[in-house]
Amino acid sequence: MGCTLSAEDKAAVERSKMIDRNLREDGEKAAREVKLLLLGAGESGKSTIVKQMKIIHEAGYSEEECKQYKAVVYSNTIQSIIAIIRAMGRLKIDFGDSARADDARQLFVLAGAAEEGFMTAELAGVIKRLWKDSGVQACFNRSREYQLNDSAAYYLNDLDRIAQPNYIPTQQDVLRTRVKTTGIVETHFTFKDLHFKMFDVGGQRSERKKWIHCFEGVTAIIFCVALSDYDLVLAEDEEMNRMHESMKLFDSICNNKWFTDTSIILFLNKKDLFEEKIKKSPLTICYPEYAGSNTYEEAAAYIQCQFEDLNKRKDTKEIYTHFTCATDTKNVQFVFDAVTDVIIKNNLKDCGLF
């Protein structure tokens, strides 16, 4: 008799159940939402990782989108050959064939047109002849002494293809394009039942005002490092080697109060370029105390330790390191799969289910 519930009590119980259900669903939804922050020094590969997410998780670039990159491909190609020609003057390197000096003059005259998204046969011919020149190649081989796009050789070696009138950039061409990131680029995608929100906050300093809005509730940080920066000569406006600058930034982020509970994933990127460089440029350029061999494995492992040793909370915080080539879709796909598994594992830990 005393156990019967009034209609009012029943409604209250139902309401309570519904609230519990909603809270549980909200909790599960929150656990499925992943906020990823892409950080790292300039030109470390952050934007390339974002492009890869579009290719891997969002069906890639449509033909229409690829067409829109045509002008960027041409601009990157021309800026690269111009950078090499200008460096020849500074490094006092002569053309192998003196006739190339006329081509160089012609290059500066014709360069403007290609920025509009088309390349004349005349300009393509000029660039091709210059790129084949032994003096230009000698200067290209000394690119650590000046600023040159990583994709310079990729485009210049493929000039016949990209100079075709009906040329449409491929996914790989798009991946290789270099456009300075300004502001915050946000990408959304779903993978393994997780809803990812990825923020590339690599914009220039003037754009960094709003960075702080991105710092709360970050699930994981992907910190990109360009391994191949280890031997770059300091530009006049630089205080320290790019690798040391990158380490300084990593130290600050890894040990930052904002990211106490955030997984730190370290992408030691441009491993392909590093593998080539280490055969010619010793690691002691960057780390004078380095006593190991200049093999890819040993040198890469040393750089990994240099970064991981910056972690001041080794007992509570793990750094998840991966060697990457951001322009290699298969490599990024494999690595991101592993990264996602770490995020899932850590999510389960936070929920007390692991």
Partner: nanobody
Amino acid sequence: EVQLVESGGGLVQPGGSLRLSCAASGFTFSSYYMNWVRQAPGKGLEWVSSIYNGDGDTDYSDSVKGRFTISRDNAKNTVYLEMSDLKVQDTAIYYCNAYDGTLLRDYWGQGTQVTVSS
């Protein structure tokens, strides 16, 4: 040595007001974005408000917009947070944060406790 010292926290009733101060030393105060960040019991850090160097532009999280006001006095190397119409949900440790826009230099105070309770 860099120091950020917060003060002004305390116990207040819902609807009440408080003024937090943060005195900075050991760095070029006028070159930094100054922020207030809070941490409620058992929760993560939550950005509250920012005041930028140069233009003095201000920003607020939706949860405090219209109730909190941030200001800075570059001559006194101090940043303030005027809090009115306080709610129970505003209960937290409030941290002062100085940030140079790169995260290379990012400084934090020890925090000041704000408790809103009847």
